[in-house]
């Protein structure tokens, strides 16, 4: 089902997908169809640099997972960028987190045996007012 440039080496303990007893409960086609057909280079993919709470992109890679690469946001500053381009610590940069579903190879190194897994990823950062605790 996963058509890719290289083949995941087969673990001898993998269930045999040709076996009549191989569970057929769920068949997942990993080719995602409703994607935009092209990408405009002028499209705003640079929010991570232009945001008032900019972030760096960390390449979260795991060969035992599909998708094997997930881009995660790491906020660059504790504060936010003000109109002068300086970091203002009266505001806070915080990550925006999203729970997503991924497929985890199980047993490990098996090319066509997966289990569904939920993971929490940071998809960007936003600027918030800090919570101020007043001490009596």
């Amino acid at each position: 089902i996963v058509k890719a440039g290289i083949t995941i080496p087969r673990n001898p303990g993998c269930p045999n997908s040709e076996d009549k007893n191989f569970p057929r409960t769920v068949m997942v086609n990993l080719n995602i169809h409703n994607r935009n057909t092209n990408t405009n280079p002028k499209r705003s993919s640079d929010y991570y640099n232009r945001s008032t709470s900019p972030w760096n992109l960390h390449r979260n890679e795991d060969p035992e997972r599909y998708p094997s690469v997930i881009w995660e946001a790491k906020c660059r500053h504790l504060g936010c960028i003000n109109a002068d381009g300086n970091v203002d610590y009266h505001m806070n940069s915080v990550p925006i987190q999203q729970e997503i579903l991924v497929l985890r190879r199980e047993p490990p190194h098996c090319p066509n045996s997966f289990r569904l897994e939920k993971i929490l990823v940071s998809v960007g950062c936003t600027c918030v007012t800090p919570i101020v605790h007043h001490v009596a």
């Epitope: 890719a4 440039g5 990408t39 960390h58 881009w71 790491k74």
Partner: antibody, heavy 118, light 110 residues
Framework: EVQLLESGGGLVQPGGSLRLSCAAS????????MNWVRQAPGKGLEWVSG????????FYADSVKGRFTISRDNSKNTLYLQMNSLRAEDTAVYYC???????????WGQGTMVTVSS | QSELTQPPSASGTPGQRVTISCSGS????????VYWFQQLPGTAPKLLIY???QRPSGVPDRFSGSKSGTSASLAISGLRSEEEADYYC???????????FGGGTRLTVL
Amino acid sequence: EVQLLESGGGLVQPGGSLRLSCAASGFTFSEYEMNWVRQAPGKGLEWVSGIYSSGGYTFYADSVKGRFTISRDNSKNTLYLQMNSLRAEDTAVYYCTLGSAGGAFDIWGQGTMVTVSS
Amino acid sequence: QSELTQPPSASGTPGQRVTISCSGSYSNIGSNYVYWFQQLPGTAPKLLIYSNNQRPSGVPDRFSGSKSGTSASLAISGLRSEEEADYYCAAWDDSLSGWVFGGGTRLTVL
């Protein structure tokens, strides 16, 4: 069979422009990240640019930032590299690479030569 | 100058085990997976190792990769004359938001 075929290289004067293309076949193009890597004559490999998450993110080496633009057309299974304001130091073989099950650089094209000279 | 440091050359005799090192920093090797490539003379590079120690199908198990801290290494056991080539390491760099390659190691089979 998975294949990448680069084209568009050639001789160009300093300050000129070129557009490289990389035609892909044998796989679902839109699913995978693509990179351009170059190799100057007699030198090592240098990453140039990459496009990920169906174009959601594009990255560039500092040496080409502001001059080169990477893009892809999933309907044509083609990756592009628009190169402007070319310099002599951009002279190299440019390779198109595909990242799939292993994450990156699984498959390489044969390369296309770009020569920047007056 | 490359962000990842490799010895410019290495050598070994047929059947021998050779190791090629690759040194980086926390933002690249220390935080991300390492890739290794083989480039035979006059050909495009070929992926040898991905995700530190994983071999694509078709790559013999004589090739192995490992990583510790901010350094990585490629080991080739049972060296063959046809493995005389240039070997490169690479890793994503979080600080640069880009890939960094080593300068390459030319392996000579004596």
